[in-house]
């Protein structure tokens, strides 16, 4: 679709004649008749398939002819086609004496024509003006013509429709030969598609508008290029979506289970070293110099009663020092200087003659010890406590204190590590020397039965188009990674590409 | 050829929901060169465009109908579905499910059979 | 809001030409489609993009748009032709119908 268009300049008849020669009376009232039709070799009369348009009067014998285009009159005149422009035309001209005011042809007496020109051409699409004269014995016409598209036509021959558009079928205006123009931010064939934020990952975001990013499920951050784990995964980490892969030192299925209390907690004081004996359970070894189940208590080196025969301890930086009392001597006040005739043994303790008197032994009743009787008996010292327990003396009697995994009056117990019910989904557990065992069911394993192996829900293959499977072990169910170019909850349709679909 | 279907209740109380689905076979939802509308005539009225829904979740709607409106695309299913709010006798129509086409202009060059909804107590 | 105009009723003889307006503020510059509907059915698209046909719709039909004015025109008109037919064009992000024409 397009205008042929004919401007009319200057047209000079200086004796008023008309093409019979015979003059206008009183001069020749001139209006023109166009008439354009296809290419012809030569141009001849018959009907104008491209168009024809009249002018009213334009003027008397010689005139110029005034660009009337701006006030909306009628030059340039306007021919318009709704048919691709062929290139080549074909024009004719004539110019009438119009001696009253009906211009119509049957109106005009056949010797009312002054002139009339026929030219035909190539003519193609442009906005530039082609300016032509023609001149005959007696008149002189001047004129410029052009071809250009309708609004919203482009191309060489004015063929192609467009039109510019901000909408959800398409963000583009049109470039001269018709073709879309994306505005920024939007691409695809008809500029429907947004160009999502710079880095968007091209598998796992997609943006409905530009310099967006929309993560698809599994995945997350700015640039959906993280992947998101699995529910409730405390201590784990991801490589692709609902994985739960636990940091060092911990374990299960949501890396909740704490297989390193020692590193994550320091529960050892006083410099001792930390032990993992399990989930949740450790021992320590403590220095010289400390006890506790933490090595928080600080032992004092006189607490063993290291001085015989009633001598008395002190601490010292580097160890104790035993003062013994008369009669004896040596690093513990082990030897004596006694005899039974000195009454050595205290608490009714009865004294024996050895060596041939150069030296005793007391026998003490009972509640008492020590080599002259001298002390009361600590129910600790034979280390009653089995199993690491510490003893704690408490008045006349004794008790212990039992390392974890013990019990009993003398920790000689050993607590069943399965009291916790620890092995999961129905596993039955088995006490051992040093721990436990689980025996899982058919569909998980690990060390606890945390790991469920049966119920794999891709192992079916179910996503298509070379997508990555992904088992949701909470639920038993899949979720497909669709690789670029693919959706759908099996990544089974495909995206942007002509579909394979008989319509 | 793709062929369009809608499903739901003919009729609906006032002040309720109307939730409609179209299921589309013969061709994929989540091709790029397609919106999936709703279209409703009420008896003996002309046709009222409701909106559309491009397989990635954009939506599109009526201003007139759009405080109402929820429109939502399921590609797993080849699905998606109306759901109007506070309905009143107004809204009974038959309403139809479109594929309208970038390629066309927006052009809706597929049509379900419609199905009428009925707004009554 | 936006609004198409189109005339309630076109009455044509059998082999006669209908003529079928839609008008709009500035619908020259919008694309815009016709449907064809029969009673009791789903509408149908005759035209698209002004002018375009769909494949299977009769050369009979036409379209054109500009101005303000867009023209559905039957040439030859059929009996089967009589149905109504509604014009539809997109302003900024929804789709607008006209009010229908019945053509007798």
């Known amino acids: 679709s397009g205008v042929f268009q004919l401007q009319l300049q200057e047209f000079i008849n200086e004796r008023g004649v008309l093409a019979s020669g015979r003059p206008c009376e009183p001069g020749c009232r001139t209006f023109f008749r166009v008439c354009l039709k296809h290419f012809q070799a030569v141009v001849s009369p018959g009907p104008c398939t491209f168009g024809t348009v009249s002018t009213p009067v334009l003027g008397t014998n010689s005139f110029a002819v005034r660009d009337d285009s701006s006030g909306g009159g009628r030059n340039p005149l306007q021919l318009p086609f709704n048919f691709t422009w062929p290139g080549t035309f074909s024009l004719i001209i004539e110019a009438w004496h119009a001696p009253g005011d009906d211009l119509r042809p049957e109106a005009l007496p056949p010797d009312a024509l002054i002139s009339k020109i026929a030219i035909q051409g190539s003519l193609a699409v442009g906005q530039n003006w082609l300016l032509d004269e023609q001149t005959s014995t007696l008149t002189r016409l001047r004129y410029s013509y052009r071809v250009i598209c309708s609004d919203n036509y482009y191309g060489d021959n004015c063929s192609r429709l467009c039109k510019k558009r901000n909408d959800h079928f398409g963000h583009y205006v049109c470039q001269p030969d018709g073709n879309l123009s994306c505005l920024p931010g939007w691409t695809g064939e008809y500029c429907q598609q947004p160009i999502c934020l710079s880095g968007c990952h091209e598998q796992n975001g997609y943006c409905s508008k530009p310099a967006e990013c929309l993560c698809r499920p599994g995945w997350q951050g700015r640039l959906c290029n993280e992947c998101i784990p699995h529910n409730g995964c405390r201590h784990g980490t991801c490589s692709t979506p609902w994985q739960c892969t636990c940091d060092e030192g911990w374990g299960g299925l949501f890396c909740d289970q704490d297989l390193n209390y020692c590193t994550h907690h320091s529960p050892c004081k006083n410099g001792a070293t930390c032990s993992n004996s399990g989930q949740r359970s450790y021992t320590c070894t403590c220095r010289p110099g400390y006890t506790g189940v933490d090595c928080e208590l600080e032992l004092s080196e006189c607490d063993s009663n290291p001085c015989r025969n009633g001598g008395s301890c002190k601490d010292q930086e580097d160890g104790y020092h035993c003062l013994c009392p008369p009669g004896y001597y040596g690093l513990h006040c082990e030897h004596s200087t006694l005899s039974c005739a000195d009454s050595p043994c205290f608490n009714g303790g009865s004294c024996r003659e050895r060596n041939q008197g150069a030296n005793y032994a007391c026998e003490c009743p009972p509640n008492f010890t020590g080599s002259n009787c001298e002390k009361k008996v600590d129910r600790c010292t034979s280390n009653p406590c089995a199993n690491g327990g510490q003893c704690l003396n408490r008045g006349p009697s004794r008790m212990c204190r039992c390392r974890p995994g013990f019990t009993g009056t003398y920790c000689e117990l050993h607590v069943s590590d399965c009291a916790r019910n620890p092995c999961a989904h129905g596993g039955t557990c088995h006490d051992l020397e040093n721990g436990l065992m689980c025996t899982c069911p058919a569909g998980f394993s690990g060390r606890r039965c945390e790991v469920r192996t049966s119920i794999d829900a891709c192992a079916s293959s179910p996503c298509f188009n070379r997508a990555t499977c992904y088992t949701d072990l909470s639920t038993d169910t899949f979720v497909c990674n669709c690789p670029y170019g693919f959706v759908g909850s099996r990544c089974e349709f495909p995206v942007g590409l002509p579909p394979s679909f008989p319509w | 050829e793709v062929q369009l279907q809608e499903s739901g209740p003919g009729l609906v109380k006032p002040s309720e929901t109307l939730s409609l689905t179209c299921t589309v076979s013969g061709g994929s939802i989540s091709s790029s060169n397609y919106y999936w509308g709703w279209i409703r005539q009420p008896p003996g009225k002309g046709l009222e465009w409701i909106g559309d829904i491009y397989y990635t979740g954009s939506t599109y709607y009526n201003p007139s109908l759009k405080s109402r409106v929820t429109i939502s695309v399921d590609t797993s299913k080849n699905q998606f579905s109306l759901k109007l709010s506070s309905v009143t006798a107004a809204d009974t129509a038959v309403y139809y499910c479109?594929?309208?086409?970038?390629?066309f202009g927006g052009g809706a060059d597929s049509w379900g059979q419609g199905t009428l909804v009925t707004v009554s107590s | 809001s936006y609004e198409l105009t189109q005339p309630p009723s076109v009455s044509v003889s059998p082999g006669q030409t209908a003529s079928i307006t839609c008008s709009g503020d500035?619908?020259?510059?919008?694309?815009v489609s016709w449907y064809q509907q029969k009673p009791g059915q789903s509408p149908v698209l005759v035209i698209y993009?002004?002018?375009t046909r769909p494949s299977g719709i009769p050369e009979r039909f036409s379209g054109s748009n500009s101005g303000d004015t867009a023209t559905l025109t039957i040439s030859g008109t059929q009996p089967m032709d009589e149905a109504d037919y509604y014009c539809?064009?997109?302003?900024?992000?929804?789709?607008?119908f006209g009010s229908g024409t019945k053509v007798t």
């Open positions: 539809q064009a997109w302003d900024s992000e929804s789709g607008v």
């Open positions: 479109a594929r309208e086409a970038v390629s």
């Open positions: 500035g619908l020259g510059d919008k694309y």
């Open positions: 993009e002004d002018s």
